[in-house]
Every structure is written in C-alpha cells, then in structure tokens.
C-alpha cells in the first residue's frame, strides 16, 4: 500500500458523507491535493478538495448525495485515494479499501431541548441528525453537564447503552447555570467512534423555594 | 493498439523555432499525459516536459522553460512540441510518449517513433 | 536534480550468460508516498526507448522474465538472467520520484 509517512483516516456518517483527515510528515510544496473515493458496486465517483487544518493536516468531506440518502451499505467497499498534483499528473498519496459500516461516526445530535426543569432536576431531549434505518435501535449515547467552576473535561460522563434520545439529570443544585452535551455512536463496525458532542445547551434550575423543599 | 506517429525529420538554422507533431491512436487522448523526451545524437534521454490533453495544463523542466512550448488540438488527438530559439546543441532525436494522468505506477508506456531535428547554419 | 549515474558504460557479454547493470541516483528517490518510482527502459539499435522495469522491480506487460530489477534508496541494478541475441541496445535508468525526472547516461550492452 502507499502509505508512506502519511496518515490517511476517513469516516462515514451512515448516510451521504465521508469525512476525511490526511496527515504528512514533512510539509509537502504548495500543492492540490484531493481525495477520490470510487466505490466498488455503485455507478458514481466523488473527489473532494483537501484543506489544510494544521501545518501537516487537511481535511475534506466527501459529499455523496443529499444529507439523508442512503448512497452506501454494508456490503460497500470504497477505494479511497489522497492524489496530489505533481506537474500535471497525479500522485497517489495514499490509498485504502474503506469499508463505510466499519468505519462510521454519525453527526453530532440536534435539536436539544429542555422538557421540563425544575429544583434538582431537568429533563432534556435531542434528536439524532442523517442517521441510517440500518441502525433501527442499535445506538449508544454519552452525556455530560458542566457545572459552575468546572470545565467539560472534568465533567463525569453519563452512559445510556440503548437508543434514548432524552435523559434526566438529577440531583442539581436550585437556580444555578448548567450546559450539557450529548454524542452518539453506532454499536456497529469495528472502528466505528463517537460522533462529535452536540453544540451546548445552556439551561438554569429553577430557585428553591422559601420554605418549601421542592 | 495503441499509436504514437510523430512528423518527418526538420533541419533548422540557428535562432529558428521547430513544431513536432505527435498523433495519438488506440486509446483516449484526452485521458494521458504526453511527455516530451530528447536524446541528442550519442547522448543519453533528457525529459523535457509534458501536456496533460484533457485540460492543456503544461509542466516544463527548468531547463528548457521559456523556449519550449506544449500544445495539443483534442479534434485530431494531436500534440505538440514547439522549440524556438534554436541552437546546434539542440540537434537530437524528439519523442512523445504516453503516460497515465495518474502516476501510480510509471511515467510513460508507449513512445513515438522520434522525430529527428537537426540545427545547421 | 537528481542525477543518476549508470555503470558500466559498455557491457560485452557472452549469448546465454548474466548481465548486471547498476544504477546510483544522488539522492534517495524513495517519494514521500512510500513508493520508488526507479524504471528501467531499453532501447534497440535504431529504435524508440521500451519501458522494462516499474517501481525497482515490477515488470511491464510483454517483457521476459529473464529481465529483473532489484535495490532501494540510491542503488539500483537491473539483472538479465541470460542474455540474448535481441538484448543488445542501451539500457537507461529512470527516477520519477522527483521532478525533473531524470535518465541515466546509459549502459551499452553489446554481445562479445
């Protein structure tokens, strides 16, 4: 394989993208570089213009289609190729066989909301974003809430092993300001990793109130 | 089967400009590179540059910028090498080759037959 | 530019005897992809150039498998078993690892 001292690592989000990070030692010229992904059963191809995201990373998404059609499945192999222009040819950087249902990581969640808050307590939901049918229940999701004079990498994390999209935090403390977050990952595919967290939501429990425990 | 027919023989006076022609067959012109290669008379190869057809991008060795010059008309799967400025050193046996548009493997498969240019005053 | 330095420059051998040409480049001519773009192309008296040998030791399509390339970094060498009466011509090294790509000087192989 054309490996190299590269570092090639792409995801799909189980419905129309796959995401990509190339990584190489040794800063290369100022030069194009793209990813091409030809699948093996499927009539089309798509290429994406790598952007740099560090002095030696860039990163592209592959757009297969509308963000909720389904363009691969398990039984799809796709050579995933980085070229990059070398006078007027292309060199092969680096290539894979990737397989999509092996290698997933969905979209961070939407749609948080709180249901309802009180004293101690608040319920919060969320929706899943261009997750496949394939999964039906088979889902996992990870919460946290950052509390006051805290920082989220301290925030102990809440594990649901089921496909629930709310949960109910508890034993908060009354009129105080929180944010939570929640990220999602298929219990399928080997290198299968967690989606991004969700974009925060910020909520306040509501003030104990006088002489009455709530 | 795949075809690289290059123009007839050129004697040239110094200061003059060549054009060599290179007409492709057997395969899409537009899907390969030609490359342009020059071996001067008892000297080994010297690669000059290329075109990529599909789109007419050029790459020149540093060598020979300035005076060479790629072209290609896709009508008649044709490319080009013009060379201006002549001088007797330039006296060499010109090929056009093939190459995929992605270097995967190697540079050039199918070479032409050569065209011989000769710079004489 | 990377120069490649064939030896020897003229090679008198005997018909159904080995051949060894060798090739030096000036600098290593692994790309950064990993891959060495080392090749080998003969050329017949009076003919085009012939793609023999890709990437150090893969043969092109068509040709004997008496012909074989082997090396890495900067030293290359390409080995024809036994020799034949159509083996005679110039053998060149080729490095498509940088550009400019550059050829060798040539090796003259001649029979004795």
């Known amino acids: 394989a054309v490996n190299g001292t590269s570092q090639f690592t792409c995801f799909y989000n189980s419905r129309a993208n796959i995401s990509c990070v190339w990584s190489q030692d040794g800063a290369l010229q100022d030069t194009s570089c793209q990813v091409h992904a030809w699948p093996d059963r499927r009539r089309w191809n798509q290429t994406c213009e790598l952007l740099p995201v560090s002095q030696a990373s860039w990163a592209c998404n592959l757009i297969l289609g509308a963000p909720d059609s389904q363009k691969l499945t398990t039984v799809d192999i796709v050579t995933l190729r980085v070229l990059c222009r070398e006078g007027v040819r292309w060199r092969v950087m680096a290539i894979q066989d990737f397989k999509p249902f092996e290698n997933l990581r969905l979209m961070a969640p939407i749609s948080l909301q709180v249901v309802h808050v009180e004293t101690h307590r608040c319920n919060i939901s969320w929706e899943i974003s261009q997750a496949s049918h394939y999964f039906e229940r088979h889902l996992e999701f990870e919460a946290r809430t950052l509390s006051p004079g805290h920082t989220w990498e301290e925030a102990p994390l809440l594990t649901l092993k089921q496909k629930q999209e709310w949960i109910c935090l508890e034993t908060l403390t009354p009129d105080t300001q929180y944010e939570f977050q929640v990220r999602v990952k298929p219990l399928q595919g080997e290198f299968t990793t967690w989606s991004p967290w969700s974009q925060p939501l910020a909520f306040r429990t509501k003030p104990a109130a006088l002489g009455k425990d709530t | 089967e795949v075809q690289l027919v290059q123009s007839g023989a050129e004697v040239k006076k110094p200061g003059a400009s060549v054009k060599v022609s290179c007409k492709a067959s057997?395969?899409?012109?537009?899907?390969?590179?030609i490359s342009w290669v020059r071996q001067a008379t008892g000297q080994g190869l010297e690669w000059m540059g290329e075109?990529?057809?599909?789109?007419?991008?050029?790459y020149y060795n540093e060598m020979f910028k300035g005076r060479v010059t790629m072209t290609r008309d896709t009508s008649i799967s044709t490319a080009y090498m013009e060379l201006s400025s002549l001088r007797s050193e330039d006296t060499a046996v010109y090929y056009c080759?093939?190459?995929?548009?992605?270097?995967?493997?190697?540079?050039?498969?199918?070479w032409g037959q050569g065209t011989t240019v000769t710079v004489s005053s | 530019d990377v120069v490649m330095t064939q030896s020897p420059l003229s090679l008198p051998v005997t018909l159904g005897q080995p051949a060894s040409i060798s090739c030096r480049s000036s600098?290593?001519?692994?790309?950064?992809?990993?891959?060495?773009?080392l090749e080998w192309f003969q050329q017949r008296p009076g003919q085009s150039p012939r793609l023999l040998i890709y990437?150090?030791?893969n043969r092109f399509s068509g040709v004997p498998d008496r012909f074989s390339g082997s090396g890495s970094g900067t030293d290359f060498t390409l080995k024809i078993s036994r020799v034949e009466a159509e083996d005679v011509g110039v053998y060149y090294c080729?490095?498509?690892?940088?550009?400019?790509?550059?050829f060798g000087g040539g090796t003259k192989v001649e029979i004795k």
């Open positions: 080759a093939r190459g995929s548009y992605t270097y995967d493997n190697y540079a050039m498969d199918f």
């Open positions: 057997g395969y899409t012109f537009t899907d390969y590179v």
């Open positions: 075109i990529y057809p599909g789109d007419g991008n050029t």
């Open positions: 600098q290593n001519i692994v790309h950064s992809n990993g891959q060495t773009y």
């Open positions: 990437k150090v030791s």
């Open positions: 080729f490095q498509g690892s940088h550009i400019p790509w550059t």
